[in-house]
Structures are given as C-alpha cells and as structure tokens.
Interface confidence: medium
C-alpha cells in the first residue's frame, strides 16, 4: 500500500527485522514495543541492555560483525554472541537475534559495487567513473552519464550526486542538460526566451546605399540606445539601493556580487530531478538525462514580466534537487490546509503558496543590495543561489522569484508565513520593508497592525 | 497510515488510451504535490509527470508531453493519469508518488503500482 519505497527496490528489511520475528517464539511474548524497549536500555550503562526476562539483569551488548544467540545469564556473565553467517551483517554494536542481510547492488539502476559485504558492513554501491547517482529514495539511486556539455561549458563539473552543470554557447539552448541548437526552438517551447529572435533576411530592392547606411545608422542607434541604457540602469540601481535604505531602516548594503552581475547564458528552467547529497533536501538544481519537464504554463513574452500583474505561474518546477525518499519512519505532515491572507490580527500570515503575487511583493520589496544575505538567512545555500541565478540569468526578479518559490516549497506549509519573513527582515534591520510587502498585498486598510505579525 | 492505491491499468493495443486512478488517504492530499513515475521492466524508475497542490500547473516528461495529462480531484483524493496514443516503450509499472513534507521534490510514499502493457 503506501509503501515507503518502490516494490521491487526494497532496502534491507531493517525495520522488519527489528519489529517482526527477531525473537525466538518463547521470548516473543515477554518482548516490550520498541518505545518501551529503548526506556528500559537506558536503566543500563551503555553498551548493555535489559534482560528481557529479567530486568534486575544488565547483559552486555554484541560487537558488531556479531548477534545475539543468548542473553547473559547472569550479572557479571558474558552475553552469547555469533558471528554472523556469509550474506548478513550488524554494523554497530547490538542485541539483534539475526544479522541484517546484506545488499545487492542493482544492476538495473546501473549500480557496481564499490566494496563487497562484510561481517560488520554493508555492501557499498555506486556508479562508474563519468556517471553520477540521481537518488529516488534515501538508499535507492540510479546511475546516469554526467553531461560533457558540447556546444556549451562546464559551469559546476559532475559531482558523485550530481550531474555537470552546463552554460550554454550563444545560439544554443539547454534541454536535458545538453546544449541544443536554437535552430531547433519551437515557439511553444521553453527555449524561445533563451534563444533570442533571429533577424530575417528582408528581401527588397538592391539599394547600394541604403545597403550600406541603414545597418550602420541602425548599428550606432543601438549603441546610443544601449550606452543611455545602462547609464540609466546604473542610476536607477544606486537611487533604489538609497531609496531602500531611507525607507526599510538601517541598510548597510553587503559588498558583494549583485545578481545582475550573472551574464552567463542560463540554463532553461527544467524540472527534471537532480541529486542530493545525503538526506538533507538541498533544493539547487540540475537536470537528469532520463526526462525532461515542461511546464504547461504558457511563458509571458519578455524576459521579465510585468510585477504590476504579475502572471499566474509558479517558478521553474522543482527548482530542486532529486526526490530523496524519507523511509517508512519519516514523520507524516500535519494536515495544514492553505490560509488565504486574512484581516484577523490573531491569526498567522500564511503565504498563499499558489500565488506568484505573494512572492513577487517580497521581490520587489527586499533590497536588492541585501537580498543574499536575506535568501541565506531563509536557508538557502550559496550552491543554490548561484545555480538559481545561471537559470535565470537575464532576469535579476525571476531569481529572486525562483529562490523565494524554493525556500516555500522546502518550508512545512505551517511555516511559510509572512511571520517567518518579518523575522528574518527584522533580523536584518529591515522592518520597514515588510510593512512595504504587507501594504503591497493588502492595501494599507486590510493590514492588522504590523506588531501583532511579528509577535 | 498513508496509502496511495493505484488502480486502471491492464493490456492496451498501440494507439490505445487508460486511465490510471490513485486513491489516496492517511494525509491531507490538497497539500502536496504529488507525481506520476514509472518503471519498465528490467529498466530503472522514470519520472513521468508532476501537478502542484491546486492542480494549476502541470509538468512531463518529454517522452510523454502531448500524450499523456495529469489532473486531481481534491475534493475525492485522487490523482489521474489519462494516457492516450499509447506506445510499445510505455509498456512499465505506474507508481503514484507522495511527496515528503520538508520539500515537494523528495518522495516519501509510493503506491504499489499498476502495470500497463501495450502491445498488438
């Protein structure tokens, strides 16, 4: 039924033999749940545990490589230990009636073996040289070529648990993580606003000079146009950053890269897994050669859209990293149904996850001098906000977007409130901004009073 | 307990269509995302389409996009994968997926599949 990994892929049956058929028929019985069983080892010193028939008994436990074949029989006594049998094994020291069977590496999923089994470990698995393992569940993985990233460079090289990182040439675009000719960009698809507009060849009466002059006098436009451009870019950016400071107090701007800096070609949104190292969700992203993901969101033209009305799309899918399966044992949510922003003062801002307005409020709102630091304090790392901004390379707010769109998927929904929000930017001295994105989504009229959010 | 039960699949003919269903329970289903993966035989898992919480956005493998569409119904706890123009390579074991509560991404309930064969 709701199995906590793919039949057919099952882990070393850990828990069952932990909770099922451990026990010799007669001891069953007398056996405590495992709850019980873990208050009663710790009335012993460690290294030793209860006596199940007799609790007045401590027994010391087994090394591993070994198990349980009979309890001490007495205080003072040894504990009958065996060595475990070809094919099984206990990693730590134990009071198991059996040892744990050992794993096969899946050849299916392209796994070799990097160690063979041993009394007191497991099999280790793992991919060939140039493959990394893209994780389905916390101990299932599966091995894929890492991407040589032709037509493109090497952004981050292909690590144990994730595949390489590619950028793009000019004329290229990125799908299933390799470079792809914009010659071969449908309208529909995904590439058109990372493959900019091909001029067409304009077929007309052979003028000698107007041949010759018009692409000039269109190539110093540009340039003029271009040059007023960034010199009012650079103005704007330097009255923003003075702006924020006077309005959401006390702003010591971080010396460092902005995310406009990033002028590398970005990677194409796409949702496909890529993999975590360990168990810890890290959502930077990379996609997986065995599919790519589209979103059926139809893409606003322009690289960035109007935040007036900002469109209904979420970010990038799965701006994540590969599903790292919780086993049997991780904890089930609290049921939490989504809280639409409310008058009351009484009750949590929760952000209305399925509306970009929210997010986009909080863009605009936070200073962009500081909104690394900010996005850090949130929880996300360094490797993720780099990789956020390559894939969203020419727009400065759909990186921010897309970070903010990570964190809140990351974040419990109970969590993924405004009051979490307001403690980060009160943190950083940045309280007048939240009062900003509050007014930004409500209107000042509907706010309950800014206190009653931060308490 | 959580428990996603797979149901609609069997034997198709090449061109054919199905309906998977999957029946969840034990959670609150409107809150997750959840995902459609499969795994043919003797080869590993591939992901074949995502929705989020509202059933707004949706999102698929280039292998299936065009054919196959995902939907929920929240209101009876059931996700839907209907599959049309099927093909001999989405011959496989269909695995509705639950995401964990700490990230969308990270799967921690799977069903116990169904399997879709199509072939003449």
């Known amino acids: 039924m709701g199995l906590s990994t793919v039949p057919d892929l099952l882990l070393p049956l850990v828990l069952l033999e932990l909770l099922v058929g451990i026990y010799p028929s007669g001891v069953i019985g007398l056996v405590p749940h495992l709850g019980d069983r873990e208050k009663r080892d710790s009335v012993c010193p460690q290294g030793k545990y209860i006596h199940p028939q007799n609790n007045s008994i401590c027994c010391t436990k087994c090394h591993k490589g070994t198990y349980l074949y009979n309890d001490c029989p007495g205080p003072g006594q040894d504990t009958d230990c065996r060595e475990c049998e070809s094919g099984s094994f206990t990693a730590s020291e134990n009071h198991l009636r059996h040892c744990l069977s050992c794993s096969k590496c899946r050849k299916e999923m392209g796994q070799v073996e990097i160690s063979s089994c041993t009394v007191d470990r497991d099999t280790v698995c793992g991919c060939r040289k140039n493959q990394y393992r893209h994780y389905w569940s916390e101990n299932l993985f599966q091995c894929f070529n890492c991407s040589l990233c032709l037509n493109g460079t090497v952004h981050l090289s292909c690590q144990e648990k994730q595949n390489t990182v590619c950028t793009c040439h000019a004329g290229f675009f990125l799908r299933e993580n390799e470079c792809v000719s914009c010659s071969n960009c449908k309208k529909s698809l995904e590439c058109t606003k990372l493959c900019l507009p091909q001029i067409e060849n304009v077929k007309g009466t052979e003028d000698s000079g107007t041949t010759v002059l018009l692409p000039l006098v269109i190539f110093f436009g540009l340039c003029l146009l271009s040059l007023l451009f960034i010199g009012l870019m650079y103005r704007y950016q330097r009255w923003k950053s003075k702006l924020y400071s006077i309005v959401c107090g006390k702003s010591t701007p971080e010396k460092e890269g902005e995310l406009e800096g990033t002028t590398t070609k970005p990677l194409a949104p796409n949702p496909s897994f890529s993999p975590t190292p360990g168990f810890t969700p890290t959502l930077g992203f990379s996609p997986v050669p065995s599919s790519t993901f589209t979103s059926s969101s139809t893409y606003t033209p322009g690289d960035c859209p109007n935040f007036a009305a900002p469109r209904r799309e979420v970010a990038p899918p799965y701006q994540g990293a590969d599903p790292i399966l919780a086993t049997a044992l991780a904890s089930d949510p609290i049921p939490n149904p989504l809280q639409k922003w409310e008058d009351s003062a009484h009750k949590p801002q929760s952000l209305d996850t399925d509306d970009p307005a929210t997010l986009y409020a909080v863009v605009e709102n936070v200073p962009p001098l500081r909104w690394k630091e900010f996005v850090r304090r949130l929880g996300l790392s360094d490797h993720e906000i780099d990789r956020l901004e390559l894939q969203n390379g020419r727009c400065l707010r759909e990186a921010q977007y897309s970070m903010l769109a990570t964190w809140r998927r990351r974040t419990p929904r109970r969590e993924a409130t405004l009051e979490l929000l307001g403690r980060v930017l009160r943190d950083m001295d940045l309280l007048g901004c939240l009062e900003d994105i509050e007014e930004a989504l409500c209107g000042p009229a509907a706010l309950p009073p800014a206190p009653s959010l931060l308490r | 307990e959580v428990q996603l039960l797979e149901s609609g699949g069997g034997l198709v003919q090449p061109g054919g269509s199905l309906r998977l269903s999957c029946a969840a329970s034990g959670f609150t289903f409107a809150d997750y995302q959840m995902a459609w993966v499969r795994q043919a035989p003797g080869k590993g898992l591939e992901w074949v389409s995502r929705i989020d919480r509202g059933g707004f956005h949706t999102y698929y493998a280039d292998s299936v996009k065009g054919r196959f569409t995902i939907s929920r119904d929240n209101s009876k706890n059931t996700l839907y994968l209907q599959m049309n123009s099927l093909r001999a390579e989405d011959t496989a074991v269909y695995y509705c997926?639950?995401?964990?509560?700490?990230?969308?991404?990270?799967?921690?309930?799977w069903g116990q599949g169904t399997l879709v064969t199509v072939s003449s």
């Open positions: 997926a639950k995401p964990s509560w700490h990230a969308d991404q990270y799967f921690d309930y």
